[in-house]
């Protein structure tokens, strides 16, 4: 059998026998364009493509539409994989989304959506989610039905305000909605009563800014 040399996601990499977490090169569907991603091969059976990670505030997440489209940061640390790649990938097959959260008191929680995809850029990378389970709230902290993506230079929310400018970061803002994992990073003891922080309302409330977050996707049939 011929060895596979290009991979569309971390699940394919895992199934090829490469089972160590780290940075790998992925290829856009139906293209030769490449992108570097962090693959988590340890959590829940492995094969997870990490599409977002926050841990220390080292990367500025108040970025432009183009930057969120193409991705930014470092896959070894804080980064955003890129809306265009994720849209193309999740449009090809059914994917699940796992969101892992850490607070400043040593607690961890997660939300798992059994179907996740992003619409194309023509639909402002609108998020689609179904089937929530997990420990980070019984109600989805990403507004349902899904919202369009907004950035500081592309206001697609449903507020008379500009959510991205005010809350910081690009996100699927509603008006402005119960979450923003791309908000301003606040260190410990400065992380409460901050509406523009890293928020997951149905776990920690409106003013609590989280310590660390990871968004990762994997094929539903993995």
């Amino acid at each position: 059998k011929e060895e596979q040399t290009t991979f569309r996601d971390c699940a394919e990499i895992f199934k090829s026998g490469l089972t160590t977490s780290g940075i790998y090169t992925l290829t856009f569907p139906n293209s030769t364009e490449e992108i570097k991603a962090y693959c988590d091969m340890d959590v829940g059976g492995g094969g997870w493509t990490v599409i977002q990670h926050r841990e220390d505030g080292s990367v500025d997440f108040q970025r432009t539409w183009k930057e969120y489209k193409e991705g930014f940061g470092s896959p070894l640390g804080e980064y955003w994989l890129g809306n265009e790649f994720v849209s193309q990938l999740t449009g090809q097959h059914r994917y699940v989304l796992k969101i892992q959260l850490k607070d400043w008191e040593g607690n961890e929680a997660h939300s798992l959506y059994d179907h996740f995809y992003l619409a194309g850029e023509e639909s402002n990378y609108r998020i689609h989610l179904t089937g929530l389970t997990g420990t980070a709230g019984k109600i989805s902290s990403i507004s349902q039905p899904g919202s369009d993506f907004s950035t500081k230079d592309s206001d697609n929310d449903k507020c008379i305000c500009k959510c991205s400018q005010m809350l910081s970061g690009g996100w699927w803002f509603d008006a402005c909605g119960p979450s923003n994992l791309n908000g301003q990073y606040y260190p410990q003891k400065q992380n409460t009563n901050k509406f523009n922080g890293i928020k997951w309302y149905y776990w920690k409330g409106s003013g609590y800014s989280l310590k660390a977050t990871t968004m990762m996707i994997r094929p539903a049939d993995f």
Partner: antibody, heavy 122, light 112 residues
């Protein structure tokens, strides 16, 4: 389109009661904190009361504490203000107002009802 | 309670001319998140108030760009670059940093 439609105002004698209602539409009512603000004839604006999205947090102005009760019914998309022991100085146009931002972020009012006049007079 | 003081209380303006309203607070309105919890509202004759500026300097959607807000801490200003007839009404500043929220006395803008 966001709409806040008020009802329940009128003329009432001092010491009596009145209940104001505010029917919300065009947005997810259960996600927003709500307020009552009043304006005495020819005067400025005065905040009266606040209730959080779930109803778990409530605040009152000192001038109405113990006499007014704010409540909400998220199933009916409605906000209420029960006003007891009314005084002449409570005469005002009462406005319901929605927080600018959802999920109990208190920064100000994004939308206002049309107002309802409460006149307390013997 | 935080006391909000506006000036002037009356502001006659010629159409096409600029206008400026000052608002001072008895305590700083600068939150640790970097925002000033100061909003501006306009109440046109016979109407409910409407939001113009939120968090000090952010113009609400649908508000003409001739309106701008500035300032930080305790001193804030609402500017209208070119006053139009439809801008008449009473302008209020409001602080949302502490409960109870409090308003300025209002500034009545009228056309000369």
């Amino acid at each position: 389109e966001v709409q806040l439609v008020q009802s329940g105002g009128g003329v009432v004698q001092p010491g009596r009661s009145l209940r104001l209602s505010c029917a919300a539409s065009g947005f997810t009512f259960s996600s927003y904190g709500m307020h009552w603000v009043r304006q005495a004839p020819g005067k400025g604006l005065e905040w009266v009361s606040y209730i959080s999205s779930s109803g778990s947090t409530i605040y009152y102005a000192d001038s109405v504490k113990g006499r007014f009760t704010i409540s909400r019914d998220n199933a009916k998309n409605s906000l209420y203000l029960q006003m007891n022991s009314l005084r002449a100085e409570d005469t005002a146009v009462y406005y319901c107002a929605r927080d600018l931002l959802d999920y109990d972020i208190l920064t100000g009012y994004g939308y206002w009802g049309q107002g309802t006049l409460v006149t307390v007079s013997s | 309670d935080i006391v909000m003081t506006q000036s002037p209380l009356s502001l006659p303006v010629t159409p096409g001319e600029p206008a400026s309203i000052s608002c001072r607070s008895s305590q700083s309105l600068l939150h640790s998140n970097g925002y000033n919890y100061l909003n501006w509202y306009l109440q046109k004759p016979g109407q409910s108030p409407q939001i113009l500026i939120y968090l000090g300097s952010n113009r609400a959607s649908g508000v003409p760009d001739r309106f701008s807000g500035s300032g930080s801490g305790t001193d804030f200003t609402l500017k209208i670059s070119r006053v139009e007839a439809e801008d008449v009404g009473v302008y209020y500043c409001m602080q949302g940093l502490q409960t109870p929220p409090t308003f300025g006395q209002g500034t009545k803008l009228e056309i000369k």
